[in-house]
Interface confidence: low
Amino acid sequence: MMTGTIETTGNISAEKGGSIILQCHLSSTTAQVTQVNWEQQDQLLAICNADLGWHISPSFKDRVAPGPGLGLTLQSLTVNDTGEYFCIYHTYPDGTYTGRIFLEVLESSVAEHGARFQIP
C-alpha cells in the first residue's frame, strides 16, 4: 500500500535568463528511494540514482545542475522552458510516486514568486 505523499514547489514563475530550483519532497513513507527522475513533458532531464549518483541528459548539460538535495536547478531560462516538470520517485517497496511542477518563464522584469524561488 502506498502511503507516501509528494510535496512540490507547485506553480512557479521566473524571469527569462534567470535560474530556478525545482524541488520535490517525498514524505509519510518509510520506503527507500532508489532513483529520482526529472522529466519535462516527454523529455528526461536528469536522474539521481541512490547508488550511481547523478546523470544529466547530454542535451541539458549546459543548463541543468544537480541539487540541492534531490532537486534540480535550471539555468539560463528561456520562454521555451515554460511547461510541466515531473519528479518521479522510484521507491522500494512502494513503487512510483510522481510530483508535478508548472513553470512559467516570463519576459517581464517582474515574475510572480520570483523573490521566493529565483536565484539572486
Partner: nanobody, 120 residues
Framework: EVQLVESGGGLVQPGGSLRLSCAAS????????MGWFRQAPGKEREAVAS????????YYADSVKGRFTISADNSKNTAYLQMNSLKPEDTAVYYC?????????????WGQGTLVTVSS
Amino acid sequence: EVQLVESGGGLVQPGGSLRLSCAASGGAFSTVAMGWFRQAPGKEREAVASIWRSGDSTYYADSVKGRFTISADNSKNTAYLQMNSLKPEDTAVYYCASSYSSSSGLGDIWGQGTLVTVSS
C-alpha cells in the same frame, strides 16, 4: 522569513583547508535539502555539493570529490562544507542554498555568498 547566513570563507594557501557554515533561520520551517554552489569570476554558477535532510543522499561535483565533504546538523538547520587540499581553481564565491518546508509549502532560499580565495 527564512534567511541563510554563510560564514567561514577567507584567504588560504594552496593545499590548505577551510570549513564553510550555512545557518538557516527566521521562522517555523524545516530544511529539506541544503547545498553549496560556487561562482568563479566570469564563470557560470556550478553545483559543488548537496545533501538531503536524511543524510542518505549526497552529491559532489567531480572536481571536488575526495577533497570536499558536506554535512548537516538538522537540529540547527545548518550545513557545513569541509574543504581540504584546496587549489587555486577553487577560488570563487560560495553560495549556500536551502530547500525548506513550512506552513506555506516548499520554498527555496539562497545566501549572499562567502568569498574563498586560494592563493600563495
